[in-house]
């Protein structure tokens, strides 16, 4: 009598999550008596999957009808599908008996389960960081099967290269995920910046999924300061400009000194945004010339972002002649200046 | 609109150098990669590299190293493809072409350069 | 580096005719990154499908394209005169980006 076959004609079966996998098997005799059982993987710690006669296995079913006389179809479909399932089938025949006795194993069928990427979540530094610095975003992914996937940075339209990409676990597992770190050159420019990361898998069939940080909640664009002072009124008051410009973010504090004394303090708000995305700000101070005696050291203080203040200071001197009084004179741009109004 | 304008054709011989400049318009230039394309005379397109239109680093092929230089005027929104050396292997029509998150999707009308003695 | 190759390099077809071109890869290609070009003699290559199976914009629909690892396709379900064109697919799954050598759509 020829000897029974166990047929598992797949090797290997791919299937989506959320999908159903049939696995087929066929015996190539009636002979010996005696049920067929499935398990996953080999050896003593298999795990049955399905057994006709007993135990309850709500997500797997027969394709054909195993109590159909001369039966010889043992394929069963598994439903909704996630990558826990994924594994090695293998169809077993067992002889009847008390117990029955394993008789014959199928080659076993491989079952991939293929699992989208979750969207990937991109998260930047914890501190604003400004123009020419380098930042770090990070970019995660979860959950997908085969392995194999493609990610890609860019900053707006240009790829992005200083990147180190890890996928987790290194072996076989049901299910991976990407972690990737991008490093960023900011510039004054990149308020209105974007970093993508850009995942692609199998899955997909195409469309990669996108993740995104604005370099607005990464950069700090510390403000220029530029004080000017306009010709002194007929009434001898002097009127002094601050300008702050070219600043991001928005949060902003000044602080007029007379003396090193606090004038008047205005926080910035509801800006008009330069095309750039950062802001500008001017503030004003009238001097009463005459009622001081000697000359006025004033100082225009900028605290921007929580950051050290910055200073601009320059003199105007009371014991001069008014009427020779200078028009549209500034401060010089860099560290703490003072001038001499005359 | 968008469009990438290139220079007009250029007859050299061997041993000289040219330039070949791609200016852009209708979008922020330094927010897009700028890929160089060639197409020698019947034949197909090759990807002869990149250049990062930020930060000015380029990224070149192993067979367009060397005598193959791209170069930027961000604030004239140009980038620009040199060739010194020239040989009559290098004859071919030279394109630019954005790249970004859809590669490829605006491209010069490509450049005619004629190698000869 | 991953070598595109396209088959067939040379094809006629007769308007009405659904026409098939292939590009095949020595290594898997992300589907995300795998576009078709077009070109007509005398002009520059116009985008014509990205990310496999994305038609550009313009690119009449009876045009797709499919595939995935190291087989991919452009179909055109009937072929039109103002088709005839030479068809380019573009990896830029990984470096250094490459062409195939296109095929040379011909009207019968």
């Known amino acids: 009598e020829e000897e029974l076959q166990v047929i598992q004609p797949e090797k290997s079966v791919s299937v989506a999550a959320g999908d159903s996998a049939t696995l087929n098997c066929t015996v190539s005799s009636l002979i010996p008596v005696g049920p067929i059982q499935w398990f996953r993987g080999a050896g003593p710690g298999r795990e049955l999957i399905y057994n006709l006669k007993e135990g309850h296995f709500p997500r797997v079913t027969p394709v054909s009808d195993p109590t159909k006389r001369n039966n010889m179809d043992f394929s069963i479909r598994i439903s909704n599908i996630t990558p826990a399932d994924a594994g090695t089938y293998y169809c077993v025949k067992f002889r009847k008996g008390s117990p029955d006795v394993e008789l014959k194993s199928g080659a076993g069928t491989e079952l991939s389960v293929r699992a989208k990427p979750s969207a990937p979540v991109v998260s930047g530094p914890a501190v604003r960081a400004t123009a020419e610095h380098t930042v770090s975003f990070t970019c995660e992914s979860h959950g997908f099967s085969p392995r194999d996937i493609t990610l890609k940075w860019f900053k707006n339209g240009n790829e992005l290269s200083d990147v180190q990409t890890n996928v987790d676990p290194a072996g076989k597992s049901v299910s991976y995920s990407i972690r990737s770190t991008a490093r960023v050159v900011l510039t004054r420019r990149d308020v209105h910046s974007q970093v993508i990361c850009e995942v692609a898998h199998v899955t997909l069939q195409g469309d990669p999924l996108r993740g995104t940080a604005n370099l607005s909640e990464a950069i700090r664009v510390p403000p220029f300061l530029e004080v000017t002072q306009q010709s002194m009124r007929a009434d001898n008051q002097v009127n002094v400009t601050c300008q702050v410009t070219k600043f991001y973010p928005q949060r902003l504090q000044l602080t007029w000194l007379e003396n090193g004394n606090v004038s008047r303090t205005e926080m910035a708000s509801a800006l008009p945004e330069n095309k750039d995305g950062t802001y500008n700000w001017t503030s004003w101070l009238l001097v009463n010339v005459s009622a001081h005696r000697d000359d006025v050291k004033l100082t225009c203080q900028v605290e921007h972002d929580g950051q050290p203040a910055v200073n601009k200071s320059f003199s105007v001197k009371v014991s001069a002649h008014p009427k020779e009084q200078g028009s549209n004179t500034a401060a010089e741009n860099t560290g703490t200046n003072e001038r001499n109004i005359y | 609109q968008i469009q990438l304008v290139q220079s007009g054709p250029e007859l050299k011989k061997p041993g000289e150098t040219v330039k070949i400049s791609c200016k852009a318009s209708g979008y922020t230039f330094t927010h897009y990669s700028m890929h160089w394309v060639k197409q020698a005379p019947g034949k197909g397109l090759k990807w002869m590299g990149w250049?990062?239109?930020?930060?000015?680093?380029?990224t070149y092929v192993d067979d367009f190293k060397g005598r193959f230089a791209f170069s930027l005027e961000a604030s004239a929104s140009t980038a620009f493809f040199q060739i010194n050396n020239l040989k009559n292997e290098d004859t071919a029509t030279y394109f630019c072409?954005?790249?970004?998150?859809?590669?490829?999707?605006?491209w010069g009308q490509g450049t005619t350069l004629t190698v000869s003695s | 580096q991953i070598v595109l190759t396209q088959s067939p390099p040379i094809m006629s077809a007769s308007p009405g005719e659904k026409v098939t071109l292939t590009c095949s890869a020595t290594s898997s290609v992300s589907a995300s990154y795998l576009y078709w070009f077009q070109q007509k003699p005398g002009s520059s290559p116009k985008l014509w499908i990205y990310s496999t199976s994305n038609l550009a914009s313009g690119v009449p629909a009876r045009f797709s394209g499919s595939g995935s690892g190291t087989s991919y396709s452009l179909t055109i379900s009937n072929m039109e005169p103002a088709d005839a064109a030479s068809y380019f697919c573009h990896q830029w799954s990984s470096y250094p980006y490459t062409f195939g050598g296109g095929t040379k759509l011909e009207i019968k």
């Open positions: 250049i990062n239109t930020e930060t000015a680093e380029p």
């Open positions: 072409a954005r790249g970004g998150l859809r590669q490829g999707d605006y």
